[in-house]
Structure formats: C-alpha cells, structure tokens
Interface confidence: low
C-alpha cells in the first residue's frame, strides 16, 4: 500500500499558486507524484509522475473554487488522492508592495507599486484584480515604538513637516476594505530628513 502525500497545502502569493506537499516515508523506493485539478467535472493532469513535492497551479482562473488533488505513486501502485479546495481571489496572500522614498528637506515623498502578478501582462498588478485596493502606510521615528498609520488616497504620499535631521522609517501594505483583508508589510525603509525649509524671519 502506497501512503498518501502529507501536509498538502497551497502556497499562494500574488496568485502564484504552488501546491506543496511532503513525501511520506516509504521503504520500497522513491515515490513519484501526480497532481490534478478539476475542470468541467473532469480531473486534468497538471504535474505527472514528478519527483518534486510541489506543482505550479498559477494558470488557474483567479475566481471560483478549484478542487486540486495529489497522490503518491510507486511502480503500478498508488495512494489515495488527497484533495484540497482553493479559491485564489479569496485565499492568495497579498505580498508587500514596492516603495520608493525620497527625502526633500523636512518631508518624505513616497511612491507605491502594487505587487506584480507574475503570470500576467508585464503591467498587471494586484490592483487590477481588486477594485477596492488601497494602501496602508505606517511610519515612525527610528528608535521609537510609537507608530502612525495613514491611508493614502493615491499611489503616492508625502509626509510633511517632519523633524529635521531625524531618521524616519516607513513601510506599506496593500489593504482591501471591502474584504477587510490586509497584505504583508514591506520591509521598512529608513531615511533621514535634512533641514527645515521654513525661512527664518
């Protein structure tokens, strides 16, 4: 009897959908695996007789529930199928956006870029999929614990009237208000302001 794959799960980030599993202990030899998806009531092969413990399902439609399954195989024997259900638009993890930060005197000018969807057109981003897409920005004075959050209206934001010659850290994430779903924070970017631009009287 061939044991089934273990710890079967979908690792989906920005619609890059990788079905992953672990090979069970099997004394007779090396197992291979076949992964399939349900299409119009028929299961279609996606990865056949692979020695890998993952299969890329990024080409699935972003919408609707998908049934995926994987089994282990050895010679003419095979395990039972292990099934999972996956809805990309609901289940994919929203990866951190990109961010550019520029210091201009006592202000920080930020531009945000929604995460790219790898399998789509070059310009296609998560913003194209989710109508309610917005950004959360949090910033803080480096070395302090107090964080401030803002929700920019656009793909850019300016933090003005900051303390001069002070290092501020900024990070951004995607947020979907209609789903109350937040993405992953980007890594903090820390920049030092320069002089106060106000003219002395």
């Amino acid at each position: 009897m061939v044991p089934p794959p273990e710890n079967v799960r979908m690792n989906s980030v920005n619609f890059k959908n990788i079905l992953q599993w672990e090979s069970p202990a099997f004394a007779k030899g090396n197992l291979t695996f076949t992964a399939q998806y349900l299409s119009y009531r028929i299961f279609q092969d996606k990865c056949m007789n692979t020695t890998l413990t993952e299969c890329d399902f990024s080409s699935l439609s972003k919408y609707g529930d998908h049934t995926l399954r994987v089994r282990a195989e050895f010679a003419d024997e095979h395990s039972d199928w292990v099934n999972i259900t996956f809805c990309p638009v609901d289940d994919t993890i929203i990866g951190p956006p990109g961010m550019q930060v520029e210091v201009l005197a006592d202000s920080l000018h930020m531009r945000f870029l929604a995460p790219k969807i790898e399998n789509e057109y070059e310009t296609w981003t998560m913003k194209n999929v989710y109508n309610s897409w917005t950004y959360n920005v949090q910033y803080w004075k480096n070395g302090t614990d107090e964080k401030f959050q803002i929700t920019p209206q656009y793909d850019f934001e300016v933090l003005r009237n900051l303390e001069p010659w002070t290092t501020y850290c900024v990070q951004v994430r995607g947020f979907l208000p209609d789903r109350n779903k937040a993405g992953e924070w980007s890594e903090p970017v820390c920049e030092q302001t320069t002089h106060d631009e106000t003219v002395p009287s």
Partner: nanobody, 126 residues
Framework: QVQLQESGGGLVQPGGSLRLSCAAS????????MSWVRQAPGKGLEWVSQ????????SYADSVKGRFTISRDNAKNTLYLQMNSLKPEDTAVYYC???????????????????WGQGTQVTVSS
C-alpha cells in the same frame, strides 16, 4: 532534495570577466524567480540581481548595472551571472537564491528566499 550549486568563481584581475552558474535540482526551477545575492568580507548580504520565472524581466543593483547580466535556461535548470568590468569592490561570496515570491524589482520591498546555494567566492585583485 533541493540543491542550488554555484560554480564559476575564482580570482580575476580588475577589468576582467567571470561567468557564474547556478545549477538547480529538486524543485520546480521554472516556477521560481531567481536572484544573485553577495556578501563581501565583513559585510552583510547585498542583493545583486534578479530574474523572473520566464526570464523576460530582469533588474540589477545600481552598483552592478551595465556590468552584470543575469540570465536563465529553464531547460537546463540553470541560472547565470555574466560579470564584466570587475572591480575590487565586487569581491564577495556570491549566492544564488530561489524565491516563490518575486516582487517588482528596482523598488524597495521584501525579498524572501525559499532556497539558497552554498556560494562561490569571487576575488577581484591585481
């Protein structure tokens, strides 16, 4: 098991060239974004370059732009880094890394790697 094996490093004079290779096995190479990351003596990791799954989109750190070229051959499960006009400051251990989370590049952003190679030493010295 997953393996990323770098090769092609060595000692080269300033202005010289090297081509690094990274042979991948044990995972779906063509489904992963690939990067080169380096670590100079006594310094932290520095991202050098990355390439998307299909090879059509590449990006580079400012310090290597115009001198280094990243490429991949999915049929051979191999990543490459062509390094020209090498400078002493390029001396480092070069690692290849695979990421199922490849983000838009020349922007600040999280770069999390799922698999790493063991590294190959590049020394640029006269």
């Amino acid at each position: 098991q997953v393996q990323l094996q770098e090769s092609g490093g060595g000692l080269v004079q300033p202005g010289g060239s090297l081509r690094l290779s990274c042979a991948a096995s044990g995972f779906a190479f063509s489904s992963y974004g690939m990067s080169w990351v380096r670590q100079a003596p006594g310094k932290g990791l520095e991202w050098v370059s990355q390439i998307n799954t299909g090879g059509g989109s590449t990006s580079y750190a400012d310090s290597v732009k115009g001198r280094f070229t990243i490429s991949r051959d999915n049929a051979k499960n191999t990543l490459y880094l062509q390094m020209n006009s090498l400078k002493p400051e390029d001396t480092a251990v070069y690692y290849c890394a695979a990421s199922s989370r490849l983000y838009s590049s020349s922007w600040y952003g999280s770069r999390e790697y799922d698999y790493w190679g063991q590294g190959t030493q590049v020394t640029v010295s006269s």
